[in-house]
Interface confidence: medium
């Protein structure tokens, strides 16, 4: 769910969570891509 | 069929507290971020309190920040707003709110048909 | 604070003909690439409807006359031919800055 990063904003905290969420996938796709050239 | 139905509202005299709750039905409550709107007689809409997921974080503007607070229970799927040091300006209608599951701060995706809070002597 | 100027406070407009409501934010409510302004519609008695996030984009379940652009400081709403179930109070709010702003409201009715 969305707990995880303090801010004392809360459009900042979705923000930086948007963020988290952006670069999990990122990274996600690039290790299924590592794992699918092996 | 997403649900949200709020209770507590009343008369309460200026100085005095009052507790509203928010029952959530129809989604995965724990995994949506939450938020109290409110709407003076006759005038527009102002956020009033907004809470994270798990309940670990909370915002408010400055208008009823260290008076209001926001909390939730999501093993009962209910969200409260307990309101002290009320003032003849907390008069409103009070609405919670469900935050939408995008990555879009603020907008609010789904709402309850209120409940009425007077402040008067 | 960021203030939201709506404009016109009250339109009147003949059933399907188009509506337009204008947004001014006194700051921008861009980061990022997004823009973070929403749009709600409130008829009487009822509580606020989510039509518009980030600025363009159409909740699900919302009739496609309805449609949202901009970016910065100035947005708009527009509905493209009025119908009779579209009388309500139209509400901008940004949620680039803490604390969420709402804009004064603008009244559309059928002339």
């Known amino acids: 769910h969305s707990d995880g990063i303090f801010t004392d904003s809360y459009s900042r905290y979705r923000k930086q969570m948007a963020v988290k969420k952006y670069l999990a996938a990122v990274l996600g796709k690039r290790y299924k891509q590592r794992v699918k050239n092996k | 069929e997403v649900q949200l139905v709020e209770s507590g509202g009343g008369l309460v005299q200026p100085g005095g507290s009052l507790r509203l709750s928010c029952a959530a039905s129809g989604f995965a409550f724990n995994n949506y971020d939450m938020s109290w709107v409110r709407q003076a007689p006759g005038k527009g809409l102002e956020w009033v309190a907004t809470?994270?997921?798990?309940?670990?974080?909370?915002w408010y503007p400055d208008s009823v920040k260290g008076r209001f607070t926001i909390s939730r229970d999501n093993a009962k799927n209910s969200l409260y707003l307990q309101m002290n040091s009320l003032r003849a300006e907390d008069t409103a209608v009070y609405y919670c709110?469900?935050?939408?599951?995008?990555?879009?701060?603020?907008?609010?995706?789904?709402w309850g048909q209120g409940t009425t809070v007077t402040v008067s002597s | 604070d960021i203030v939201l100027t709506q404009s016109p406070d009250s339109l009147a407009v003949s059933l399907g003909e188009r509506a337009t409501i204008n947004c001014k934010a006194s700051?921008?409510?861009?980061?990022?690439?997004?823009?973070?302004m929403t749009w709600y519609q409130q008829k009487p008695g009822q509580p606020p409807k989510l039509l518009i996030y980030a600025a363009s984009h159409l909740d699900s379940g919302i009739p496609d006359r309805f449609s949202g652009s901009g970016s910065g400081t100035d947005f708009t709403l527009t509905i493209s031919s009025l119908q009779a179930e579209d009388v309500a109070v139209y509400y901008c709010?940004?949620?680039?800055?803490?604390?969420?702003?709402f804009g004064g409201g603008t009244k559309v009715e059928i002339k």
């Open positions: 809470i994270t997921g798990g309940g670990s974080y909370t």
């Open positions: 709010q940004q949620s680039n800055e803490d604390p969420w702003t």
């Open positions: 709110a469900r935050l939408t599951g995008y990555d879009q701060a603020g907008a609010m995706d789904y």
């Open positions: 700051q921008s409510v861009d980061y990022d690439g997004d823009s973070y």
